[in-house]
Interface confidence: medium
């Protein structure tokens, strides 16, 4: 199709940050202000996301890609492309629909997203509680009254668990 | 001869969803931006925003954020656009406009009414 | 937003006379040099048609009656002279900023 397209269409020779221009004799004009095409043979120039209010402009639109935004401090980015900007919470909050709310018993959030997880239950690798869990932080299982003999492993802290709903940014 | 044929009229319950098409023809479909546009009856204009068919780039009318989806397929040169969680606030003719180099639109499809009523 | 005020709301015009529509913007809708001000044209049960665009410049196929002229704030659009075709709904829209809005339209009659 592409080939196809280069030999009848005078507009394909249009780079990118340029549009095919009709009005001019199918000549490449550069995009318009605010605008920008990343690929070629376009016949118009695509408008720039604006970051505007709780986001901000992280990279500047060009002639050839468009605008990245993030969020202002105290908001986190959501979403493919910071599509969303969420409100950071404290260490020990969750994000709920009436604002931050304090972790429950039995749970922590150690980050400024996010929910709040469960308490790593010790016993369930026959492990006992060395350091009870606080809101922020979750509990450290030691070793269990078996393992306390002579030679045996120290202390080891549960695995971090991973965020539900979050890549990595 | 470009055209933008859009697919007929029609009727939803409130809180239904509807989607509609727009056939370009007559020209390089994924060359041009395709644009969605609202006439309630006897009123003005709305703009909804729009899709780069090429790259499925996309932006909104804020207003429209939750209420339109915009997509596109190649293949067949059709735009499309899905209104969700309808109400009686969107009982009207919904267009497709190419858009021209300029910005502005120069080919406008005839438009597709969308009636809710219960 | 930016918001376009047309007036008059209605025009009545005798054939072969002047007819002059105005839209004012509440920001410029300038960018470099270039005025993102179009005018449309629309008759009842159709789609509008393209008349101006970039403020003067006329759309494709449209007669030499139809002339478009400002910047920044202040447009208009001259019908001249007035043709019995001409009664319909204008439009002017800008696209210089996102959410591309129009004016609140401006019907043209015969007198």
């Known amino acids: 199709f592409e080939r196809t397209r280069s030999l009848q269409d005078p507009c394909s020779n249009c780079p990118a940050g340029t549009f095919c221009d009709n009005n001019r004799n199918q000549i490449c004009s550069p995009c318009p202000p605010n605008s920008f095409s990343s690929a070629g043979g376009q016949r118009t120039c695509d408008i720039c996301r604006q970051c505007k209010g709780v986001f901000r402009t992280r990279k500047e639109c060009s002639s050839t890609s468009n605008a990245e935004c993030d969020c202002t401090p105290g908001f986190h980015c959501l979403g493919a492309g910071c599509s969303m900007c969420e409100q950071d919470c404290k260490q020990g909050q969750e994000l709920t629909k009436k604002g931050c709310k304090d972790c429950c018993f039995g749970t922590f959030n150690d980050q400024k997203r996010g929910i709040c997880r469960p308490w790593t239950n010790c016993s369930l690798d026959g492990k006992s509680v060395l350091v009870n869990g606080t809101k922020e932080r979750d509990v450290v299982c030691g070793p269990s009254p078996a393992d306390l003999s002579p030679g045996a492993s120290s202390v080891t802290p549960p695995a971090p668990a991973r965020e539900p709903g979050h890549s990595p940014q | 001869q470009v055209q933008l044929q859009q697919s007929g009229a029609e009727l939803a319950r409130p809180g239904a969803s509807v989607k509609m098409s727009c056939k370009a023809s007559?020209?390089?479909?994924?060359?041009?931006?395709m644009h969605w546009v609202k006439q309630r009856p006897g009123q003005g204009l709305e703009w909804i925003g729009y899709?780069?068919?090429?790259?499925?780039?996309?932006i909104y009318n804020q207003k429209f954020k939750d209420k339109a989806t915009l997509t596109a397929d190649k293949s067949s040169s059709t735009a499309y656009m899905q209104l969700s969680s309808l109400t009686s606030e969107d009982s009207a003719v919904y267009y497709c406009?190419?858009?021209?180099?300029?910005?502005?639109?120069?080919?406008w499809g005839a438009g597709t009414t969308v009636t809710v009523s219960s | 937003d930016i918001v376009l005020t047309q007036s008059p709301a209605s025009l009545a015009v005798s054939l072969g006379q002047r007819a002059t529509i105005s839209c004012r913007a509440s920001?410029?809708?300038?960018?470099?040099?270039?005025?993102?001000m179009n005018w449309f044209q629309q008759k009842p049960g159709q789609p509008p048609k393209l008349l101006i665009y970039?403020?003067?410049n006329q759309g494709s196929g449209v007669p030499a009656r139809f002339s478009g002229s400002g910047s920044g704030t202040d447009f208009s659009l001259n019908i001249h002279p007035m043709e019995e075709d001409d009664t319909a709904m204008y439009f002017c829209?800008?696209?210089?900023?996102?959410?591309?809005?129009f004016g609140g339209g401006t019907k043209l009659e015969i007198k």
């Open positions: 007559g020209y390089i479909f994924t060359t041009y931006a």
């Open positions: 970039s403020a003067s």
């Open positions: 406009a190419r858009l021209g180099g300029h910005w502005y639109f120069d080919v």
């Open positions: 899709i780069n068919p090429t790259t499925v780039y996309t």
């Open positions: 829209q800008q696209s210089k900023e996102v959410p591309w809005t």
């Open positions: 920001e410029s809708v300038d960018n470099y040099g270039i005025s993102f």
